[in-house]
Amino acid sequence: MKVLQEPTCVSDYMSISTCEWKMNGPTNCSTELRLLYQLVFLLSEAHTCIPENNGGAGCVCHLLMDDVVSADNYTLDLWAGQQLLWKGSFKPSEHVKPRAPGNLTVHTNVSDTLLLTWSNPYPPDNYLYNHLTYAVNIWSENDPADFRIYNVTYLEPSLRIAASTLKSGISYRARVRAWAQCYNTTWSEWSPSTKWHNSYREPFEQH
C-alpha cells in the first residue's frame, strides 16, 4: 500500500481543516488508514482523524482544530496499521479556504433596486471576520449568456444594484462566495443559490 498523491490540506481558519490524498489503488480509507495530527506545541497531544473515501483510491479527512492562529503548525502522520506511509506538516494560515457565506437573500421591495444581503460565515472574534471580500454571481435561468459577477470589495455583506440592469419579467438566481486577501486564500465554495423574479416599472417614454 502506497500513497500516490500526497495529502494536501486547506483550513477554514476556524475549526476544520480538510486533507485529501490518493492511494495507489482502491482503498477502504476508514478501515485501513489513520491520519494523526499534532500541534507543534509543548506538551500537546496527537489527535486521530478517520478518513472517508473520496472516489476509489481517494481519501479525505476532516481535522478538528480548536481555533486557529497564524503561528499554528501541525505535524501529519499517515498510518496504515503499524506502517507509516507518509509524514508531513501543515500550517493552516498558509492554506486557507474560507467558509461559504450563508443566508443569501434578495430584497426586491426597495424601489427599483435589488438589495442582496448575506451572512459573514465567521464570528466577530475570528480574524477573518473583518477581512473577507465577496463575489456575487447573478445569472438568468432562461439565458445562459446572461451571467455576471459583481465584486464586493467593502466589508459589508450586501450588494445594491438597479433592477433595470437585469431583464424584466424573468427569473434570476444569485450566489455568493468569499476570499481574504490578507492570507491570500482561495475562494470559498459558492453559497446555496437563491431565486427571484425580476420585475420593475419601465420608465415612461417622453415624446
Epitope: 506545541f41 492562529v69 499554528d72
Partner: antibody, heavy 120, light 108 residues
C-alpha cells in the same frame, strides 16, 4: 467555579525534599496540560515544569531538571511536584497553572500559590 | 534558548494616558505563541492576551497585543487606575516556555 488550590509548601533545609499538591475543581484535569511556575521574592515569573493532559509527557526547565518530578492523578483531579535536592535559589511562591490549547500556551487559570522556603 | 527582554523596566504614566509595553525575543518566533499577563501585589498573574493579539475571556478591549518575528507590543489605550501593575510577556513554543523579566507600570 474553576479553581486551583496548591498545598505542601513550607520551610525545608538545603538538600531536603518537599512535595507540592494542586487540587483542581470546576474542570477536568485530564483535558489540560498543567504546569508549575514559580516566583522568587521580589523577582519575576520563572517556568518550572509541565505535563501533558493524558499521555504523561513532561517538560522541565534546566534549573530543576533531574531534581524535580511532575506528575498527575487524573481520577483525583490533582497535580503534584516532587522537589528534591532543594537549594536556596528554589525559594519562591509556586503556582499551579492550567494551559488551554485554545489559548495557545496562555495560562488562563492560576492557583493562589504556595510558599517554599529553603534555608538552614 | 530564547530570551525575552521587556522594556522599559518601569513606566510612569497617568490615568487616561496610553501605555505601550515592549517585549523583544532574542530570535524570531514565527511558530511560537506570545502571551501577556498582569500581576498585582500579593496576587497571582492574570492572562490578558494570548496568541500575540487575542484577548482572554473578560479582558477589556482597552488591552491589545500586536507584533511578529522578534518584536511584540502590549498597548493599553487609556489607563484606568486598576491597570497599574507589573506586566509580563511569555513565549510558549514547541519545546520551551519563557517569561520576560516584567515591566512595572506605575502612577506618575
Amino acid at each position: 467555579e474553576v479553581q486551583l488550590l496548591e498545598s505542601g509548601g513550607g520551610l525545608v533545609q538545603p538538600g531536603g525534599s518537599l512535595r507540592l499538591s494542586c487540587a483542581a475543581s470546576g474542570f477536568t484535569l485530564s483535558s489540560y496540560a498543567m504546569h508549575w511556575v514559580r516566583q522568587a521574592p521580589g523577582k519575576g515569573l520563572e517556568y518550572v515544569s509541565g505535563i501533558s493532559p493524558t499521555s504523561g509527557s513532561t517538560y522541565y526547565a534546566n534549573s530543576v531538571k533531574g531534581r524535580f518530578t511532575i506528575s498527575r492523578d487524573n481520577p483525583k483531579n490533582t497535580l503534584f511536584l516532587q522537589m528534591s535536592s532543594l537549594r536556596a535559589e528554589d525559594t519562591a511562591v509556586y503556582y499551579c497553572v492550567r494551559v488551554k490549547v485554545r489559548y495557545r500556551g496562555g495560562m488562563d487559570v492560576w492557583g493562589q500559590g504556595t510558599t517554599v522556603t529553603v534555608s538552614s | 534558548e530564547i530570551v525575552l527582554t521587556q522594556s522599559p523596566g518601569t513606566l510612569s504614566l497617568s490615568p487616561g494616558e496610553r501605555a505601550t509595553l515592549s517585549c523583544r525575543a532574542s530570535q524570531s518566533v514565527s511558530s511560537a505563541y506570545l502571551a501577556w499577563y498582569q500581576q498585582k501585589p500579593g496576587q497571582a498573574p492574570r492572562l490578558l492576551i494570548y496568541g500575540t493579539s487575542r484577548r482572554a475571556t473578560g479582558i477589556p478591549d482597552r488591552f491589545s497585543g500586536s507584533g511578529s518575528g522578534t518584536d511584540f507590543t502590549l498597548t493599553i489605550s487609556r489607563l484606568e487606575p486598576e491597570d497599574f501593575a507589573v506586566y509580563y510577556c511569555q513565549l510558549y513554543g514547541a519545546s520551551s516556555v519563557t517569561f520576560g523579566q516584567g515591566t512595572k507600570l506605575e502612577i506618575k
